[in-house]
């Protein structure tokens, strides 16, 4: 029950996280114009990964896409790539985790297969979350660097063909959405990995065998002694010896995994 709850909660948390990563990637407010000490008040600029928007004092808002690829900073391209990789991995993870959910029965899928799928989706969610956090952090670092460069340029002279950036940019809402969403996806992934441990029959059962002397000879069946990993065929404690040989399960209560022949 706890495993199902952990898996289900991990799935829901990851789902919210990935929805957040998608929302953040599409948002226009990755960076917003810093209004402090800025003499230009007629326009307010905010920018996303894909386009720049200007809201004018009249209330009119216009957005334009960054149609050039070569003219854009490599860091912006890297952030775009990280966010897209995060979304793709997250989406695949969600698809895998739907089939891995313990509460959903698909044909005669064994618990071992579900455990493997849960672990796979968990790892995908973790990587997805890390990609989003990394992408947002790289962008935030870029803004901080740009902010201080702009501040320095603001107080330099204007002799000759000065090319300074007088508009400073600060963190937009999308950065916070991205950080939270990445964190949720990461947490969801960890929960899926924890759930996987509970789904997989972990113990290695070594069948302890007791031999009882009997009147007739005991036929030993070669290859009968098997170590079950929990992923093999002998998970139901079947008798694998005939005659006077009986498994300890018939005599003792539950053997621990440290009981050897």
């Amino acid at each position: 029950m706890a495993v199902t709850a952990c898996q289900g909660l991990g799935f829901v948390v990851s789902l919210i996280g990935i929805a957040g990563i998608i929302a953040a990637t599409c948002m226009d407010q990755w960076s917003t114009q810093d209004l402090y000490n800025n003499p230009v008040t007629a326009v307010f600029n905010y920018q996303g990964l894909w386009r720049s928007c200007v809201r004018e004092s009249s209330g009119f808002t216009e957005c334009r896409g960054y149609f050039t690829l070569l003219g854009l900073p490599a860091m912006l391209q890297a952030v775009r790539a990280l966010m897209i990789v995060g979304i793709v991995l997250g989406a695949i993870g969600l698809l895998v985790s739907i089939f891995a959910l313990k509460c959903i029965r698909i044909g005669s899928m064994e618990d071992s297969a579900k455990a493997n799928m849960t672990l796979t989706s968990g790892i995908m969610f973790i990587v997805s979350g890390l990609c989003a956090i990394a992408g947002v952090s790289v962008f935030a670092n870029m803004l901080v660097t740009n902010f201080w460069m702009s501040t320095a340029n603001m107080y330099t002279g204007m002799g000759g063909m000065v090319q300074t950036v007088q508009t400073r940019y600060t963190f937009g809402a999308a950065l916070f959405v991205g950080w939270v969403a990445g964190g949720l996806t990461l947490i969801g992934g960890v929960m899926m990995c924890i759930a996987c441990r509970g789904l997989a029959p972990e113990e290695t059962n070594y069948k302890a065998v007791s031999y009882h002397a009997s009147g007739h000879s005991v036929a030993y069946k070669p290859g009968g002694f098997k170590a079950s990993t929990g992923f093999g065929s002998n998970t139901k404690n079947k008798k694998i010896y005939d005659g006077g040989a009986r498994t300890e399960d018939e005599v003792q209560s539950y053997p621990s995994k440290h009981d050897y022949v």
Partner: nanobody
């Protein structure tokens, strides 16, 4: 690369008028503002007037009601009509284009001297 060419500066009488023009050549990102800033010796640069690509206009407090900015988007040119000139209007006037492409970009002209004589 954007190049800005200013013209129209010079000597003007107290209460007189001058017309500055600034032509931008090169590829300019669609969202932008074009405008004028000035810097008197020993002073900080000061906003004179800007005209945005969307049609909004903003004037500096010291020139409101006296200066008029206009913009020709087809020619990528901005004009500053200065009237009722005062001695405190004496400064180097710089043409500026600020584009709102990724993290913004500023382009400045060489500056044109405006001197108001008594």
């Amino acid at each position: 690369q954007v190049q800005l060419v200013e013209s129209g500066g010079g000597l003007a009488q107290l209460g007189g008028s001058l017309r500055l023009s600034c032509a931008a050549s090169g590829s300019i990102f669609g969202l932008n503002f074009m405008g004028w800033w000035r810097q008197a010796p020993g002073s900080q640069r000061e906003l004179v007037a800007i005209a945005t690509s969307g049609g909004s206009i903003q004037y500096g407090d010291s020139v409101k009601g006296r200066f008029t900015i206009s913009r020709d988007n087809a020619k990528n040119t901005v004009y500053l009509q200065m009237a009722s000139l005062k001695p405190e209007d004496t400064a180097v006037y710089y043409c500026n284009v600020h584009t709102y492409d990724f993290l913004g970009r500023d382009y400045w002209g060489q500056g044109t001297q405006v001197t108001v004589s008594l």
